[in-house]
């Protein structure tokens, strides 16, 4: 049962991520900012279950590339961002086995490209935004707040797809 | 579901301290800030402090930096608030709440709120 | 520490019309995107309960009768049409920057 299998992993990277907080979120109020998170590409109800789990995917993917950069090993804590990474690598693979199984039940699976690319652009404007902030403690805790969010509503997502089970 | 149990009312005298709690259920109570509001009767909500479960970490507004000290047992998911030299103006309902949306730092779960009392 | 100012104190709004309040900061609270502002409906004996978050974002499960506009210093809540359980105070309450403040309130008579 795989959206039950990383609703778990998804609680348990963000119980990490949680406590990946190094330094105080209230000394970064003025660093905050809005990445654009799009939120209506997790709306569960307009894909089917493959595009729903492709963008699930490229969440985790791109979530994962960005906690694996030299500078994410600079900021956080060592053994719980490995943690983290391996959270994340596990659902990735589950995620994959997924698209496989749904790929052979569905008639003809569309490919949600624009989808993809608005999550892609999504992270592309996080990186800008750690380049311009110089990988600055505070931006990274901006950040750790971001992908908790994205999190969630990856969350979220799984949920309404559990239902359509 | 998601629920906050603060300790009954307290009737204090002047100069004394009082200590209530703050039980969460229902969620994860180390991963989420915990907010302290106070309401003084008939009157708006003022914004006491905020502590971090997961490892202790609090701020403070400065206006209660040196009245009210928060606390957290993560073993019994309990939140503590203690107020030190009470005055007639610390008369007061004192909420909980839980963190909401990470760092927009809005409120969504309230406690009932701890009543106290402040006479001679 | 900033200063939320709102406005009417009180109002009284017939069934079905509309209800606007008003929230004042005395600085900024928008930066980059977003605006920390956020609305709580206080009914009496009850605690506070969150309605708009973000400026204009609706809290999951509050009815569409709710919105809430603006940015930097200036805010509005409206309520349209009023009906009858909306008679309650209003708080704004930002967190723009540390101390988070909350308005006087903003109490709502349903005539």
């Known amino acids: 049962d795989l959206p039950q299998t990383h609703s778990l992993g998804n609680r348990r990277a963000l119980i990490l991520l949680a406590q990946m907080g190094r330094i105080s979120p209230f000394s970064c109020l003025k660093d905050r900012h809005d990445f654009g998170l799009p939120q209506e590409e997790f709306d569960g109800n307009q894909f089917q279950k493959t595009q729903a789990i492709s963008v699930l995917h490229e969440m985790i993917q791109q979530t994962f590339n960005l906690f694996s950069t030299e500078d994410s090993s600079a900021a956080w804590e060592q053994s719980l961002l490995e943690k983290f990474s391996t959270e994340l690598y596990q659902q990735l693979n589950n995620l994959e086995a997924c698209v496989i199984q749904e790929v052979g039940m569905e008639e003809t699976p569309l490919m949600n490209e624009d989808s993809i690319l608005a999550v892609r652009k999504y992270f592309q404007r996080i990186t800008l935004y750690l380049t311009e902030k110089k990988y600055s403690p505070c931006a990274w805790e901006v950040v750790r707040a971001e992908i908790m969010r994205s999190l969630s509503f990856s969350t979220n997502l799984q949920k309404r797809l559990r239902r359509k089970d | 579901q998601v629920q906050l149990q603060e300790s009954g009312t307290v009737l204090a005298r002047p100069g004394a301290s009082v200590k209530m709690s703050c039980k969460a259920s229902?969620?994860?109570?180390?991963?989420?800030?915990m907010h302290w509001v106070k309401q003084r009767p008939g009157q708006g909500l003022e914004w006491i402090g905020v502590?971090?479960?997961?490892?202790?970490?609090?701020t403070y507004n400065q206006k209660f930096k040196d009245k009210a000290k928060l606390t957290a047992v993560t073993s019994a998911n309990t939140a503590y608030m203690e107020l030190s030299s009470l005055t007639n103006e610390d008369s007061a309902v004192y909420f909980c709440t839980r963190n909401y949306k990470y760092d927009y730092y809005t409120m969504d779960y309230w406690g009932q709120g701890t009543t106290v009392t402040v006479s001679s | 520490d900033i200063v939320l100012t709102q406005s009417p104190a009180s109002l009284a709004v017939s069934l079905g019309q509309r209800a606007t309040i008003s929230c004042r900061a005395s600085k900024s609270v928008s930066t980059s995107g977003h605006s920390y502002m956020h609305w709580y409906q206080q009914k009496p004996g009850q605690t506070p309960k969150l309605l708009i978050y973000l400026a204009s974002n609706l809290e999951s499960g509050v009815p569409a009768r709710f919105s809430g506009s603006g940015s930097g210093t200036d805010f509005t809540l409206n309520i349209h049409p009023v009906e009858e359980e909306d008679a309650a105070t209003y708080y704004c309450?930002?967190?723009?920057?540390?101390?988070?403040?909350f308005g006087s309130g903003t109490k709502l008579e349903i005539k």
């Open positions: 309450q930002h967190s723009g920057e540390l101390p988070f403040t």
């Open positions: 229902g969620y994860s109570f180390t991963t989420y800030w």
């Open positions: 502590i971090y479960p997961g490892n202790g970490d609090t």
